[in-house]
Amino acid sequence: APTSSSTKETQEQLDQLLLDLQVLLKGVNDYKNSKLSRMLTFKFYMPKKVTELKHLQCLEEELKPLEEVLNLAQGKNSHGGNTRESISNINVTVLKLKGSETFMCEYDETVTIVEFLNRWITFCQSIISASSS
């Protein structure tokens, strides 16, 4: 059974993941220009359902394409460090949260970077609210 300390740790990790995803989304929405329109051509794969922590495997699998798009957007921009830091944070947090169980992602649809980040933000929020109620 999960201890109160492990539950608290999971909660903190979810809060951190949520924050990093929100930072990335804010960055993306700042590109209301030719860069955003390029970023929107990149496909991101979303699984059939995202309801459990093990489904974070599917987020992990899309982190490389995510970094690729954000690097394109920033180019020689000085904000590049923020992106790399957020991606790195997400990677570490996801590895902690998803556990060691192997999960095979069944991808259902392709979405834009904006939709992709929004959906994973919603996932974090729903898990956080479920665990705190």
Epitope: N33, S34, S37, T41
Partner: antibody
């Protein structure tokens, strides 16, 4: 209603220059990236260049890089294409277009202006 | 340089279904967009992000994508669907926009 109106086309000799304009109205011009697309007579569409909403980022097709310059004046809600060292193969109808919604599709197009490069 | 490949022409009888393909190495990772251009007119966006229709575009036009091929389908093709159709996307780097060569749709009859 969104309107894009191109002007500045005409007959020009090879090696000479021409500047095209695209007057925009009906939307917040300074909020959106803008594109130039051309179409040679009887041929397909070719993307030429695009510029970010604030003019800080510009991209060009290989065929025009170093000869054409895209720019914009947000206070005049106008897009420009400065075309130098013109070649006969630059002969085309030039359209300006914009991805008006949060999509990368070009939702709105002008009616085009014809540029003919010939001696 | 990156290319999107389309058949030059497609012909169908009225009421039949026409399928126009667009092939490109980057399409598994990039969305495709489709434009319809009628004679003497500016192009019109008919499909974006592989399969979405802008408002005002009839349901007879639909899009799909699988692997390196994007497909525009015109169901129950009519004379008014006669036009040139172009696919559009970005290259492998995502930096440059590219149009396919265009496909002339002819509705026989």
């Amino acid at each position: 209603e969104v309107q894009l109106v191109e002007s500045g086309g005409g007959l020009v000799q090879p090696g000479r220059s021409l500047r095209l304009s695209c007057a925009a109205s009906g939307f917040t011009f300074s909020y959106y990236g803008m594109h130039w697309v051309r179409q040679a007579p009887g041929k397909g569409l070719e993307w030429v260049a695009d510029i970010s909403n604030d003019g800080s980022n510009k991209y060009y097709a290989d065929s025009v890089k170093g000869r054409f310059t895209i720019s914009r004046d947000n206070s005049k809600t106008t897009l420009y294409l400065q075309m130098n060292s013109l070649r006969p193969e630059d002969t085309a109808v030039y359209y300006c277009a914009t991805p008006y919604y949060d999509s990368s599709g070009l939702d709105y197009w002008g009616q085009g202006t014809l540029v003919t490069v010939s001696s | 340089s990156y290319e999107l490949t389309q058949p030059p022409s497609v012909s169908v009888s009225p009421g039949q279904t026409a399928r126009i393909t667009c092939s490109g190495d980057a399409l598994p990772k990039r969305f495709a967009y489709w434009y319809q251009q009628k004679a003497g007119q500016a192009p019109v966006l008919v499909i974006y992000e592989d399969n979405k229709r802008p408002s005002g575009i009839p349901e007879t036009l639909s899009g799909s994508s699988s692997g390196t091929t994007a497909t525009l389908t015109i169901s129950g093709a009519q004379e008014e669907d006669e036009a040139d159709y172009y696919c559009y996307s970005t290259d492998n780097t995502g930096g440059l926009w590219v149009f396919g060569g265009g496909t002339k749709l002819t509705v026989l009859g």
